[in-house]
Amino acid sequence: AMHVAQPAVVLASSRGIASFVCEYASPGKATEVRVTVLRQADSQVTEVCAATYMMGNELTFLDDSICTGTSSGNQVNLTIQGLRAMDTGLYICKVELMYPPPYYLGIGNGTQIYVIDPEPCPDSDF
């Protein structure tokens, strides 16, 4: 129900890394925020990664997560790594204000991430 903004399109780097900003308009003074990245394909939604952070502190994903991020005010800079061409799709930023009450939830319109697998290097003859 909160407004959440994210870019419409992002092109992953040749190393399979994509970064985008997720910005939310907070109705209140949240101290604990949860950010989740969802991937939507047709009617299927899967969780890519999630992190909870205290306002003013760093965003920490689990060690084995493919995501990293930093936060600044109501803005979260998200990076997804290890992407392959088959991971091309719509990535949705979900923001939840967990504490204190009231609970608020916002869903972005999604960022279409395009991933192009790098061409294998041709053999060189010297």
């Epitope: 209140g28 009231p102 939830l105």
Partner: antibody, heavy 115, light 108 residues
Framework: EVQLVESGGGLVQPGRSLRLSCTAS????????MNWVRQAPGKGLEWVGQ??????????YYSDSVKGRFTISRDDSKSIAYLQMNSLKTEDTAVYYC??????WGQGTTVTVSS | DIQMTQSPSSLSASVGDRVTITCGAS??????LNWYQQKPGKVPKLLIY???NLADGVPSRFSGSGSGTDFTLTISSLQPEDVATYYC??????????FGGGTKVEIK
């Protein structure tokens, strides 16, 4: 302690108006989107409408069943939300609850629309 | 508007039973779902918010799961004080924040 107290309910004739008030205490009223929810006798819960707060320009939203007849407003300085009900119909008979976010609920006030 | 369909509309179970109530949305709602408990003659009370988060003071026998369009409220071991009607509600913008039709839970 969080408290939401609704008032203004009663018996009213079809076509007439009524204004409900919801007085809040024990939490930061201005941080909350205020909702009105109603429950007709023996029926389920029905979301009536919502007023958001200042960061959201006090946007209001209504269910189709009350759109154009009901108006929600708020006074953050007094921590009060209002539900102005015009052109009342018999099917508006219900217990009306106000809620802060959807976390906090008042005890409800009964509105009976009958001739 | 997104429709919320709850099932069953009523159920009767024994004390200690595991009870499951489902709520389906007509479109993807990304976990934007609350569950409420309303005991007879009482005010509704928030049980679960954001599909999976237990509200303050709610016993741990209650849990919520699901994402996308299909959601579940589970009572792991039904207690006499759990006799109530349970409602799901979509909390995704834009409103309306529609409620499901309710599930009445009784003890056998």
């Amino acid at each position: 302690e969080v408290q939401l107290v609704e008032s203004g309910g009663g018996l009213v004739q079809p076509g007439r108006s009524l204004r409900l008030s919801c007085t809040a205490s024990g939490f930061t009223f201005s941080d909350n989107w205020m909702n009105w929810v109603r429950q007709a006798p023996g029926k389920g819960l029905e979301w009536v409408g919502q007023i958001r707060n200042k960061p959201y320009n006090y946007e209001t939203y209504y269910s189709d069943s009350v759109k154009g007849r009901f108006t929600i407003s708020r006074d953050d300085s007094k921590s009060i939300a209002y539900l102005q009900m015009n052109s009342l119909k018999t099917e508006d008979t219900a217990v009306y609850y106000c809620t802060g976010g959807m976390d906090y609920w008042g005890q409800g006030t009964t509105v009976t629309v009958s001739s | 508007d997104i429709q919320m369909t709850q099932s069953p509309s009523s159920l009767s179970a024994s004390v200690g039973d595991r009870v499951t109530i489902t709520c389906g949305a007509s479109e993807i709602i990304y976990g934007a779902l609350n569950w409420y408990q309303q005991k007879p003659g009482k005010v509704p009370k928030l049980l679960i918010y954001g599909a999976t988060n237990l509200a303050d003071g709610v016993p741990s026998r209650f849990s919520g799961s699901g994402s996308g369009t299909d959601f579940t409220l589970t009572i792991s071991s039904l207690q006499p004080e759990d006799v109530a009607t349970y409602y799901c509600q979509k909390i995704l913008s834009p409103p309306p924040w529609t409620f499901g039709g309710g599930t009445k839970v009784e003890i056998k």
